[in-house]
């Protein structure tokens, strides 16, 4: 059976939207009005992995872009990057672990924990127009809480 996917946008708890800044970077910044069209639409695929009531494994692809968020070690540190995939083979139910995030729902907010690197989360900075990254702390300066807005296909 084909993998189930939905289209959505994500905003951090400060209401910053995510946009592609150049070919290799995802940034978080406040958008208004027509600029909202710049925000990245994700295709969130529900994939194989450890699942519980509040924890669901997903992959986050940029809609129709062949690019997925992935987690790899760089300088011995878990790092978030975009990775290109062959559109003929992705998305798939059994995604490689580097593409998998545990979507955790707490008090109507979402966290995205790397399946490859437990306790590392998709994060944004308090500052405007900074890269989205993988952070190893929750509840500190950096933001790990998001809201999801559904987008019709």
């Amino acid at each position: 059976a084909p993998v189930r996917s939905l289209n959505c946008t994500l905003r951090d708890s400060q209401q910053k939207s995510l946009v592609m800044s150049g070919p290799y970077e995802l940034k978080a910044l406040h958008l208004q009005g027509q600029d909202m069209e710049q925000q990245v639409v994700f295709s969130m695929s529900f994939v194989q992995g450890e699942e519980s009531n509040d924890k669901i494994p997903v992959a986050l692809g940029l809609k129709e872009k062949n690019l997925y968020l992935s987690c790899v070690l760089k300088d011995d540190k878990p790092t978030l990057q975009l990775e290109s995939v062959d559109p003929k083979n992705y998305p798939k139910k059994k995604m490689e672990k580097r593409f998998v995030f545990n979507k955790i729902e707490i008090n109507n907010k979402l966290e995205f924990e790397s399946a490859q690197f437990p306790n590392w989360y998709i994060s944004t900075s308090q500052a405007e127009n900074m890269p989205v990254f993988l952070g190893g702390t929750k509840g500190g300066q950096d933001i790990t809480d998001f809201t999801m807005q559904f987008v019709s296909s």
């Epitope: 592609m20 070919p23 990245v40 940029l62 872009k65 690019l67 790899v72 290109s84 995939v85 062959d86």
Partner: antibody
């Protein structure tokens, strides 16, 4: 500074295999993908595949799937490309190149190339 | 796969002149408003050298006379004033979709 140094020229018979090496220096080998691109005499460039040494992940061009294998040795910061069942049309210069970012970045550093000649 | 067609195949110009090289893709190579097209220069017996990435960004150490433009399916490399060392083969390459593909090249020769 970043350098990719490849192994020397090879002459192979049809049906044989060849293994070309690419030693990386001047950066953290496991942080960047390595791509392999070939160029037949007087022809254009053709991407064969890529490998991420930090996790041993690969992308292969469908055209070469089943014939090409990309591996790495992190202890020596060396990437390898092995092509099997060689035929005369595989005669080419084989380059390793480093994408600037992830697996899809532009190729900002290149090896000097390795000429592989397939001839009976 | 995305096919890239370069034109002309050969361009004969003199030093000091302006060179315009074209690359057309079989489908759009834009992603989020960014053109995923790169340009390389190759001289005989040498490896390719990056000139332009993401359609219009100069590679490290590339002289200002090299510029790139375009979006969607049509891209252009312009050399504003040709120097003797610019005579070489130029390739475009798309990095929007696997497999990465290159154009067949444009040979820039001295008239």
């Amino acid at each position: 500074q970043v350098q990719l140094v490849q192994s020397g020229a090879e002459v192979k018979k049809p049906g044989a295999s060849v293994k070309v090496s690419c030693k990386a220096t001047g950066y953290t080998f496991t942080d960047y993908w390595i791509a392999w691109v070939r160029q037949a005499p007087g022809q254009g460039l053709e991407w064969m595949g890529s490998i991420f040494p930090g996790g041993d992940y690969t992308n292969y061009n469908e055209k070469f799937k089943g014939r090409v294998t990309m591996t790495r040795d992190t202890s020596t910061s060396t990437s390898y490309m092995e092509l099997s069942s060689l035929r005369s049309e595989d005669t080419a210069v084989y380059y390793c190149a480093r994408p600037y970012y992830s697996n899809y970045g532009h190729f900002d550093y290149w090896g000097q190339g390795t000429l592989v000649t397939v001839s009976s | 796969e995305i096919v890239l067609t370069q034109s002309p195949a050969t361009l004969s110009l003199s030093p000091g002149e302006r060179a315009t090289l074209s690359c057309r893709a079989s489908e759009s190579v834009d992603n989020s408003g960014i053109g995923f097209m790169n340009w390389y220069q190759q001289k005989p017996g040498q490896a390719p050298r990056l000139l332009i990435y993401a359609a219009s960004n100069q590679g490290s150490g590339i002289p200002a006379r090299f510029s790139g433009s375009g979006s969607g399916t049509d891209f252009t490399l312009t050399i504003s004033r040709l120097e003797p060392e610019d005579f070489a083969v130029y390739y475009c390459q798309q990095n929007k979709e696997l497999p990465w593909t290159f154009g067949q090249g444009t040979k820039l020769e001295i008239k």
